[in-house]
Interface confidence: low
């Protein structure tokens, strides 16, 4: 049962006002989330009439408001100048109309004496279905049944029981006559158009004994819900079109200056290139509802968006739609951060991800956008540490610098890492952002040995060369684990000859493991940073082996060559990624990655730290 509570039924008379109070649990989230009052259509979809974000529909303009009282967990909907047209089923709720916490309210407005007697009012959304009920007396049971539309002073035949169908209603109307004993016939009109709006007349029989019933059909074009989002932020369009179209192709389109609607994304695989890397169409629920997420909002994304259903995956008249008017606020609370980050093959990137600073305790995530079909974004890493297996040793999410920004570091880059990545949290969804990683020509600035085999109980020295441009940066070594990278004590060893293109001597920072233990096996990162802002990193895998007989410390040239090793690893990663593309959650079990010695291939190069040139030569 929904925790939102309010009056189940409200009744009044025309011209009067009502004040409907709805209660909700006054949790912090509830107090600040959107409140709405919406009207349920024939299919069950609920069209917003008034909301706490300032939206008021045209037929409520000047006579309704919604006031939130967060301190005591209530909101009040005031509606004045009631008319019989206001009778119907409504919801007061929190969040999103189609999916939020809500309470059903039935509003019944009795008709005033000035209204003609017996007119049934049907209020239905465009694209939906209406069933008009037409009662008749027993004596007219065998006689012709018909539905007319009143246009001015004339009545135009729409359908009758002699199989006539007006061309304007072809293939979307049927007249049903029940079995004996039931004194009512129905006319069902599907895929309603705005032009179907108007007064209809049911008729059974002819002459003075004929039965007549007036029906007022009001076909509503969906009022666009006003959506205000921040520049660089994210928007989610939740689309609930009803069970009638659950198995029909879905789309989101944007209305252009010609008042046609350009497809942004659809379930048939079409996607506007302007949204590449920053859009997902989420899977349908069984009721046919779906949602579209767009990140990295730009000013040019503003406009009127429609979601709908049609076998062609694009807008067609007479099919159900839902509408939004998106406004992108340029005075954004979301800070500027690079939308493109460049790295070189073998090198690294450090991506800054913004999040709502009020939600510092939220879980942070980083996912890889995949464009196949409707788009997906399988998670690669999260702040509680779990990393996808194929990213072991080269991906870490850091809480630094904090206060609204976290950092994701990815190293050992290959061309396969080029693509779009999303920063997100389990908090404010509007703070989702997109960054594109591009792999460019060049050499990594930091140089470390390819892979290292350490001998149990002995001393291991791992050098990391950095160019003079990093001389003012803080240098560090850390041991990677699936929960982060633990900084280790390291030693700045002064000049090195590894870089010859530098005016002053390049430098060296070393990590010493003494004595080497089994626990030392794993990935180590050398990196540079300035304060809490991270720069480049380089990774080296240390394998630990038992002490061998004398002389075995010096490995054969074949074993020292790390390059084939890396190719094996690379092709292995490619294989894994190919599987991940087919089934992106393949590696999403978030299981703890074991630090095993064979993660990067079987052979490891031993590094003699006495020669900086030799180390430079074995760097990636």
């Amino acid at each position: 049962k929904s925790p939102v509570f309010g009056p189940q039924e409200v009744s009044s008379v025309e011209g009067n006002s009502v004040s409907i109070k709805c209660y909700y649990p006054p949790t912090s989230v509830n107090r600040h989330t959107r409140k709405y009052w919406c009207r349920k259509g024939a299919s069950g979809r609920c069209i917003t009439l008034v909301s706490s974000e300032g939206y008021v529909s045209s037929n409520y303009a000047g006579r309704a408001n919604l006031t939130n009282f967060p301190e005591n967990g209530t909101f009040v909907v005031n509606i004045a100048q009631l008319s019989r047209d206001d009778s119907g089923h409504y919801k007061c709720g929190l969040g999103i109309n189609s999916r939020g916490l809500s309470f059903d309210v039935s509003l019944e407005v009795s008709q005033g004496p000035e209204l003609p007697n017996g007119t049934e009012v049907y209020t239905v959304d465009v694209g939906r279905t209406v069933t008009i009920k037409c009662p008749f007396k027993t004596e007219n049971a065998p006689k012709t049944k018909a539905l007319y539309k009143k246009i001015g002073q004339t009545s135009v035949l729409v359908i009758d029981s002699r199989n006539y169908v007006n061309p304007n209603y072809k293939d979307r109307i049927r007249l049903r006559i029940p079995g004996t004993g039931q004194l009512i016939f129905t006319v069902v009109i599907d895929r309603l158009r705005l032009s179907d709006h108007g007064l209809y007349l049911c008729q059974a029989g002819d002459g003075s004994n004929r039965d007549e019933k007036n029906a007022d059909l009001q076909v509503l074009e969906p009022e666009p819900e006003l959506v205000y989002e921040d520049l660089r932020g994210s928007v989610t369009f939740h689309c609930a079109l009803g069970l009638e179209v659950a198995n029909v192709a879905k789309f989101l389109c944007r209305v252009n200056s010609r008042e046609t609607c350009d497809v942004v994304i659809n379930t048939l695989g079409k996607r506007d290139s302007a949204f590449e890397g920053r859009i997902l169409l989420n899977p349908q629920d069984k009721d046919g509802s779906f949602s579209v997420v767009i990140t990295g909002l730009r000013k040019e994304d503003e406009g009127r968006y429609l979601c709908g259903a049609h076998s062609d995956g694009q807008l067609q008249e007479g099919w159900p739609i839902q509408a939004w008017q998106l406004f992108v606020n340029e005075e954004s609370t979301i800070p500027r951060s690079p939308t493109v980050v460049k790295g070189v093959a073998g090198g690294s990137v450090a991506v800054l991800c913004p999040y709502n600073p009020k939600e510092s305790q939220s879980l942070k995530y980083w996912c890889l956008w995949e464009g196949a079909q409707n788009g997906r974004c399988p998670l690669l890493v999260e702040s509680q540490g779990l990393v996808q297996e194929q990213y072991e040793g080269r991906l870490s999410l850091l809480q630094e610098p904090g206060n609204g920004t976290f950092t994701v570091i990815l190293n050992q880059l290959t061309t396969q890492d080029a693509g779009f990545y999303w920063c997100l949290t389990n908090g404010d969804t509007r703070w989702r952002t997109t960054v594109e990683i591009k792999i460019i020509e060049g050499e990594p600035n930091l140089k470390v040995p390819g892979n290292v085999t350490a001998v149990l109980g002995e001393t291991l020295n791992i050098p990391c060369h950095f160019p003079c441009k990093f001389s003012s940066y803080e240098k560090y070594w850390c041991k990677w684990s699936n929960t982060g990278c633990q900084t280790l004590p390291s030693q700045d060893e002064g000049p090195s000859e590894a870089f010859v293109n530098c005016d002053e001597n390049s430098r060296l920072v070393s990590l010493t493991l003494n004595p080497v233990t089994r626990a030392d096996e794993g990935w180590y990162w050398c990196g540079v940073k300035q304060g809490h802002f991270y720069g480049e990193t380089a990774a080296v895998y240390v394998a630990v082996e038992e002490k061998k007989v004398a002389g075995s410390r010096y490995v054969s040239p074949a074993k020292a060559d790390a390059a084939p090793d890396e190719k094996v690893l690379d092709s292995g990663v490619r294989e894994i990624e190919n599987k991940a593309i087919q089934d992106p959650r393949l590696f999403a079990e978030e299981k703890v990655v074991a630090d095993t010695g064979d993660q990067a291939g079987g052979s490891r190069a031993s590094v003699d730290s006495s020669s900086s040139e030799e180390q430079g030569g074995s760097s990636k």
Epitope: T33, G95, T236, L379, W422
Partner: nanobody, 130 residues
């Protein structure tokens, strides 16, 4: 280590009721979604029901075969989920597995797909006798 522990399974007569519970614990675990799947001998794992939430918004899903008979709910903290089974039938006999997820649920997840759930319990057996 995240743990999901199911309880409440057992023998029940056709037409009777049963309430299953699933408690999540470990690593300050606060899931976005919890759900129930079942697996009868020789059959694939079948979606039963799920509940997911984000802030003040709650979504409940129920599989077609149990619609109108089973309901899913959770405790206020969101770490325990319940499956209320009413009007049970012999075909409801199965091992019932609890599943949980900490992924933001509107990022390309279909709750009916077992692959899209990160954590699983060991299961509790429900036997419906005729």
């Amino acid at each position: 280590e995240v743990q999901l522990v199911e309880s409440g399974g057992g023998l029940v007569q056709t037409g009777g009721s049963l309430r299953l519970s699933c408690a999540a614990s470990g690593r300050t675990f606060s899931p976005y979604a919890m759900g129930w799947f079942r697996q009868a001998p020789g059959k694939e794992r079948e979606f039963v029901a799920a509940i997911r939430w984000s802030g003040a918004t709650t979504y409940k899903y129920v599989g077609d075969s149990v619609q109108g008979r089973f309901t899913i709910s959770r405790d206020a903290a969101g770490n325990t989920v319940y499956l209320q089974m009413n009007s049970v039938k012999p075909e409801d006999t199965a091992v019932y597995y609890c599943a949980a997820d900490r992924v933001p649920k509107d990022i390309s997840i279909d709750p009916r797909n077992p692959k899209d759930w990160d954590y699983w319990g060991k299961g509790t057996l429900v036997t419906v006798s005729s």
